[in-house]
């Protein structure tokens, strides 16, 4: 649960429930980035402002979740309360620019993703593995993944017992880990970037 | 607002067994993991284990496999503790928290208290 | 097990004082430490999880930060409802462990 998603929550748990009937409403029409799908309305409008985060940020990831968000309490003449969520969104980032992330254009965008591409700097390079791991979990990680990675004693053999799961992963699980590195370890991403 | 209301104060006997619970509210159950906290009388905090109501899955603090059985019932959003073979240093207060994820604990029970006397 | 070790075990101070309070890691743990707030008769309360960063719903005037294996809490302008317990737990290796404790008291 990171800062955007805080930041999400904050939002919606102060919105009346008109407001958030409205919001879902909205969410229903509002155009997405390509590459990602739309939250089910039978699921949707049942939901409350802690599972309506859930679900946001499961669907779009933290960094694009936020945006949508702010992109809809806008349309709703919600232009401070919009404000305030990407001002804490973006607050505090070391990633460049302000963390934002792009889009799992999986069928859009060829070759490997950049973890893939980077598996073996990152194997060598990243320190702090459990940031990770608590990132991950419960989004692509399950109870037996996560305490397989720390039950491994060294920074190397726990990204490697990482990445062995990562052959099952998607675009869009792959793109958590980034999240997560570019949370954690904003420098080394760069510096892979570049490379 | 999440919620976390444990079951009231218990008092057993050396070698019985106590079993208390945790009512979760105001958010998905399954959503997050269930951690548990011992807390003696004038001492430290000592983690117990955790449950992810998902699944089952438990994962315990070593120091405690052999005293606490933790479970949890999707339907009643309850996660439960039972202590067994109780003897007086297991006299403390017993918190249930929330986990973010299994590594911090974002919402605390109000506790319960076990008191192990002959 | 990882050892924190928290002082000092007991700080007085006037409301208004800016206070921090200590948690030193036995070994290297990264960012993974998280603070707690526990004041009598209530249950604890998350106030900075990895090492800094803030908890919505928690003041501003709560801040962490780490260096190295020392890592510490800082109140800016203690108020009368901050008077209570602090303590810290580490997530880098099973068991998760705890400070012993703080205490914030009015002097």
């Known amino acids: 649960m990171g800062r955007a998603r805080d930041a999400i929550l904050d939002a919606l748990e102060n919105l009346t429930a008109e407001e958030l009937k409205k919001f879902k409403l909205k969410l229903l029409s509002v155009p997405l980035r390509e590459g990602y799908g739309r939250i089910p309305r039978g699921a949707l409008l049942s939901m409350d402002a802690l599972d309506l985060t859930d679900k946001l940020v499961s669907f779009y990831l933290e960094t694009y979740g936020a945006e949508l968000t702010a992109n809809v309490l806008r349309d709703m003449g919600l232009q401070e309360m919009a404000g305030q969520l990407q001002a804490a969104t973006h607050q505090g980032s070391g990633a460049a620019p302000a963390g934002i992330q792009a889009p799992p254009q999986s069928a859009a965008k060829p070759g490997l993703h950049f973890i893939d591409q980077h598996r073996a700097a990152l194997i060598a390079r990243v320190t702090n593995v459990e940031w990770l791991l608590d990132a991950l979990y419960g989004k692509v990680l399950t109870d037996e993944q996560y305490q397989a990675v720390r039950a491994e004693p060294t920074n190397p053999s726990k990204m490697r017992k990482l990445f062995s799961f990562t052959p099952a992963w998607n675009w869009t699980c792959k793109d958590l880990l980034l999240q997560a590195l570019r949370e954690s370890q904003s420098y080394l991403v760069e510096d892979l970037e570049r490379s | 607002q999440v919620q976390l209301q444990q079951s009231g104060a218990e008092l057993a006997r050396p070698g019985a067994s106590v079993k208390m619970s945790c009512k979760a509210s105001g958010y998905t159950f399954t959503t997050y993991t269930m951690h548990w906290v011992k807390q003696r009388p004038g001492q430290g905090l000592e983690w117990i284990g955790y449950?992810?109501?998902?699944?089952?899955?438990?994962y315990y603090n070593q120091n405690f496999k052999d005293k606490a059985t933790l479970t949890a019932d999707k339907s009643s959003s309850t996660a439960y503790m039972q202590l067994s073979n109780l003897a007086s240093d297991d006299s403390a207060v017993y918190y249930c928290?929330?986990?973010?994820?299994?590594?911090?604990?974002?919402?605390w029970g109000q506790g319960t208290l076990v008191t192990v006397s002959a | 097990d990882i050892v924190l070790t928290q002082s000092p075990a007991t700080l007085s101070v006037t409301p208004g004082d800016s206070v921090s309070l200590s948690c030193r890691a036995s070994q290297s743990i990264g960012n993974n430490l998280h603070w707690y707030q526990h004041k009598s008769h209530e249950s604890p309360r998350l106030l900075i999880k990895y090492a800094s960063q803030s908890i919505s719903g928690i003041p501003s005037r709560f801040s962490g930060s780490e260096s190295g294996t020392d890592f510490t809490l800082s109140i800016n302008s203690v108020e009368t409802e901050d008077f209570g317990i602090y303590f810290c737990q580490q997530s880098k290796s099973w068991p998760w462990t705890f400070g012993g404790g703080t205490k914030l008291e009015i002097k």
């Open positions: 928290a929330l986990g973010g994820n299994p590594a911090w604990f974002a919402y």
């Open positions: 449950i992810n109501p998902s699944s089952g899955y438990t």
